[in-house]
């Protein structure tokens, strides 16, 4: 049967993003409509047809355009994605003979981790804090020279859609740690990044 091929995309916040749909059919469509999926009913964003060209709905005027003007292959581009743009989008190919054939492409917005790593001595112990803020939520791990060191983790969700994960390493005998390297590992979207800290006695 006739189908539409799509691909989900993950793009960084405040960068451009494109979603593409391809109608797997011998014939082009008569009109292509892009809609944003919403809880109640989909919202029309933009249409393209030979008769009327590109027609962008007012709410999307400065946000998107159709960058591949095709009736078999259609691409919309968001100029500068925000968190509100995250979601799923439907492309509807209104074809002669087979009606509306739709595909769904989902856009996920990510924010690269911002990481801070610092330490603080107390009289009898050392706290090393590693904090990572990202979207989706990052994970924080420790690589330390010896085992048995305790850590505590706090997760905080922010209104802007990012999540902070703060992990504190509690070292009871700080003298043994002086001059040694501690590594905070941040896992985000399948990539692990090492942040190294050498403890110096202030």
């Amino acid at each position: 049967q006739v189908q539409v091929v799509t691909q989900d995309e993950r793009e960084q916040l405040y960068t451009p993003a494109s979603l593409k749909c391809s109608l797997q059919n011998a014939q082009e469509a008569l009109i292509v409509t892009w809609q944003k999926k919403k809880a109640v009913s989909p919202e029309n964003m933009v249409t393209f047809s030979e008769n009327h060209g590109v027609v962008i709905q007012p709410a999307y005027k400065d946000k998107i355009n159709i960058t591949q003007l095709g009736l078999q292959n259609s691409t919309i581009t968001f100029w500068n994605i925000t968190l509100e743009d995250e979601g799923c989008y439907m492309c509807l190919f209104n074809t002669f003979g087979f009606g509306k054939i739709s595909g769904t492409a989902c856009l996920t917005v990510y924010v690269q981790p911002i990481v801070s790593l610092h330490y603080k001595f107390s009289e009898d112990h050392l706290n090393i804090t590693c904090s990572a803020t990202a979207r989706p939520a990052p994970m924080v791990f420790w690589k330390v020279p010896r085992s048995g060191i305790e850590n505590s983790t706090v997760t905080l969700s922010h209104p802007n859609g990012t999540t902070s994960v703060t992990s504190i390493l509690h070292i009871k005998d700080p003298k043994n740690q002086v001059g040694k390297e501690v590594i905070c590992q941040v896992l985000h979207l399948g990539t692990v990044t090492d942040f190294k800290q050498t403890v110096n006695k202030g």
Partner: antibody, heavy 117, light 107 residues
């Protein structure tokens, strides 16, 4: 040159089936939809259904309640329209045509199907 | 199903006349309408598609207009070969449906 050549006239008894062929030549068969319309004596044209030869996807007028089947043989560049459980009101001229999207340009010469006891 | 109603059902005119045939859809069909000409014992011939686009090879005296529910086919100056029956076809919604036809006869 482009041609759609249909099979010859048929006389059928009520309850029987008829299969009309439409042989295409002069173009790439899978690039155009093949459609079938019919016209009973003194009546308007009636869309029966169509097929996209590329995938073999077809769409039928539900008025025919599953009595119509449209198929194709890409190796023979031929489309077929089969109508079953024939009744007298199916007496008509059956035409095949081709379209690129909504652009209809060539038609077969028509096949007269007579249903009579 | 969408009903297509043509008017008039028949029409007498002379060579050189300007003739208008109308087609009304029972609901909005956008611009998804074609016009066909048919002569006795012959297959239909496509004249106009998408309401106002002329099919290649069709004389420019034929024109189409309209959108939504009301459409017209105009022949600006009738020629002897134009006497035939004309049908409109909607293809906005399946099943696609034809009008009942307008028979154009010589006066």
């Amino acid at each position: 040159q482009v041609q759609l050549v249909q099979s010859g006239a048929e006389v059928k008894k009520p309850g029987a089936s008829v299969k009309v062929s439409c042989k295409a030549s002069g173009y790439s068969f899978t690039d155009y939809i093949i459609l079938w319309v019919r016209q009973a004596p003194g009546q308007r044209l009636e869309w029966m259904g169509h097929i996209d030869p590329y995938y073999g996807s077809s769409n039928y007028n539900l008025k025919f309640k599953g009595r119509v089947t449209i198929t194709r043989d890409t190796s023979a560049s031929t489309a077929y329209m089969e109508l079953s459980s024939l009744r007298s009101e199916d007496t008509a001229v059956y035409y095949c045509g081709r379209s690129k999207r909504d652009y209809f340009d060539y038609w077969g010469q028509g096949t007269l199907v007579t249903v009579s006891s | 199903d969408i009903q297509m109603t043509q008017s008039p059902s028949s029409l007498s005119a002379s060579v050189g006349d300007r003739v208008t045939i109308t087609c009304k859809a029972s609901q909005d069909i956008n611009s998804y309408l074609s016009w066909f000409q048919q002569k006795p014992g012959k297959a239909p011939k496509s004249l106009i598609y998408r309401a106002n686009r002329l099919v290649d090879g069709v004389p420019s005296r034929f024109s189409g207009s309209g959108s939504g529910t009301d459409f017209t086919l105009t022949i600006s100056s009738l020629q002897p070969e134009d006497f035939a029956t004309y049908y409109c076809l909607q293809y906005d919604e399946f099943p696609y449906t034809f009008g009942q036809g307008t028979k154009l006869e010589i006066k």
